[in-house]
């Protein structure tokens, strides 16, 4: 009569859709020669197998190419490999060893496969820092994808100039040459599993290192409204005794170090202010002349100068004719 054997391990297995799972099966150690035949995996209640090594037997259309019997009688292996898992694979399965010439065979216990929603997301890795104008290789990887599954489709989305690099079953490389304006923009890697029709994505914000491109000086003069200087200015008239506040501002990432110098500084000159703010509480003859703001950055420096011209109050000048 029909002989029965127990599948080792759990009574149910869980797999995320689009991924792979191995349903373990070991043939009985005592297997009479006459019982030896082909291996068949069946969906509970079905007559057509989902996988078999019988060359004359058809398998279910739904599982063809995705379900495989891993047949190795020497190692007593009769496991079922499922790749590109789909929601409708959610069912109970059993294995049967049988020769078509024989009335009986060996039938295993049932095992349930539960197919859950895909929760894994791609990883995006960046080697070191992204520098403006320098190519960097970004890798989008799905290490949890099995090698034998249908290779996923990788898609990249970015405003930055990019080109596709090599890919494997589990990863895709994107070469990016970012520009200053790409800093803080989004980059998305989208991975589609065609075998199961599932798409996952991950989005990161680009952190692009770039040297200052623009330096500006905002001038606060007494109570009057501030005005901005965007380029070197030859002469700025200022009333003697007036309070002046010079605010230097520069872009760049990470932020540039701002410092103020009187005159046109040499590289190793000592600043009069180590911040972007220069307070001149009472403008006098000592303040007449050039002031320079330098924006220092590991990737390059930029500076802007303005020249102060002091207007003297008529009663304020000493001596006479």
């Amino acid at each position: 009569q029909e002989r029965r054997f127990q599948l080792e391990g759990p009574e149910s297995l869980t797999v995320q859709e689009g991924l792979c799972v191995l349903v373990p099966c070991r043939l009985p150690t005592t297997l009479p020669a006459s019982y030896y035949g082909y291996g068949y995996w069946f969906l509970e209640g079905a007559d057509v197998p989902v996988a078999t090594n019988d060359p004359d037997e058809e398998v279910q259309e739904e599982t063809r190419g995705r379900f495989h019997l891993l047949w190795d009688p020497r190692r007593k292996n009769c496991s079922l490999s499922i790749r590109d898992a789909r929601r409708r694979d959610n069912a109970a399965y059993f294995f049967r060893l049988k020769s078509k010439w024989m009335k009986y065979g060996y039938t295993s216990s049932k095992l349930s496969v539960r197919v859950m929603a895909l929760t894994h997301r791609p990883n995006i890795s960046i080697p070191g820092t992204l520098e403006s104008g320098h190519p960097s290789n970004l890798t989008c990887s799905v290490p949890w994808v099995c090698e034998q599954g249908t290779p996923p489709i990788f898609s990249w989305m970015s405003a930055a100039p990019t080109s596709l690099g090599p890919r494997t079953t589990q990863s895709s490389v994107l070469t990016i040459t970012p520009r200053p304006q790409d800093h803080s923009t989004n980059l998305t890697c989208q991975v589609t599993f065609p075998g199961a029709g599932v798409t996952m994505e991950r989005t990161i914000q680009l952190n692009v290192s770039y040297a200052p491109q623009k330096v500006a000086i905002s001038i606060f003069q007494g109570n009057s409204a501030a005005f901005k200087i965007l380029q070197n200015t030859s002469s700025l008239p200022v009333l003697e005794g007036q309070a002046l506040r010079l605010l230097c501002d520069a872009d760049g990432n990470p932020p540039a170090h701002l410092s103020w110098f009187q005159g046109f500084p040499a590289l190793n000159a000592t600043p009069i202010s180590n911040t972007g703010v220069l307070e001149l509480p009472q403008v006098g003859s000592a303040e007449e002349g050039d002031f320079t703001c330098r924006a220092q950055h590991p990737l390059g420096s930029l500076q802007i100068s303005l020249s102060l011209f002091v207007h003297w109050k008529p009663e304020g000048r000493a001596g006479g004719v």
Epitope: S34, G37, P55, D72, P73, K100, W101, M102
Partner: antibody, heavy 116, light 107 residues
């Protein structure tokens, strides 16, 4: 004890027919596939035919297809081989054997000689 | 049809020798290979099935290996009763063809 006993062999003229029988005992005959295998004098084994446990499925070697018919009677625990249009090259010891894809029990064989 | 080719056709060896007989299939037959021993005037006897499974009651000096198209029967230490003819047979698809046999003789 599992036993297979062939009978019906003998000398027959080319073109004539012969029916071999195989009586099975010691096992549930109706659960097993059965084979016929032959061996010409001084030659190797040649697989001839197989029949499923219930007789619904049969396969033959190309050399006998259309001339030989394998059948069984489970109520009598007997396997048959009907051989028609016999040729000289069918001369051999015919073994009845038990098994599915593996033959595990063999009978002692019966000699068939096709000669004019 | 699947053609089974055994080598060598005949082999001379002495008691205690290690002997290897090979069988090659014309196409992949997975592990569906059986080995039989036949002595003169006797019916064949099953030794190995499923390429490597030892039939009940067969001495452990007999072993089988292989998968796909290439298979081996090994007798680790020949005994006097092992001198016989050995046949491989594929049971992957009908017709279930035999190899031509390997006659093992006393040296």
């Amino acid at each position: 004890e599992v036993q297979l006993l062939e009978s019906g062999g003998g000398v027959v003229q080319p073109g004539r027919s012969l029916r071999l029988s195989c009586a099975a005992s010691g096992f549930t005959f109706s659960s097993y596939g059965m084979h016929w295998v032959r061996q010409a004098p001084g030659k190797g084994l040649e697989w001839v035919a197989v029949i499923s446990y219930d007789g619904s499925n049969k396969h033959y070697a190309d050399s006998v297809k259309g001339r030989f018919t394998i059948s069984r009677d489970n109520s009598k625990n007997t396997l048959y081989l009907q051989m028609n249009s016999l040729r000289a090259e069918d001369t051999a010891v015919y073994y009845c054997a038990r098994g599915g894809q593996t033959i595990d029990i063999w009978g002692q064989g019966t000699m068939v000689t096709v000669s004019s | 049809d699947i053609v089974m080719t055994q080598s060598p056709s005949s082999l001379s060896a002495s008691v205690g020798d290690r002997v290897t007989i090979t069988c090659r299939a014309s196409q992949s037959i997975s592990s569906y290979l059986n080995w039989y021993q036949q002595k003169p005037g006797k019916a064949p006897k099953l030794l190995i099935y499923a390429a490597s499974s030892l039939q009940s009651g067969v001495p452990s000096r007999f072993s089988g290996s292989g998968s796909g198209t290439d298979f081996t029967l090994t007798i680790s230490s020949l005994q006097p009763e092992d001198f016989a003819t050995y046949y491989c047979q594929q049971s992957y698809s009908t017709p279930y063809t035999f190899g031509q046999g390997t006659k093992l003789e006393i040296k």
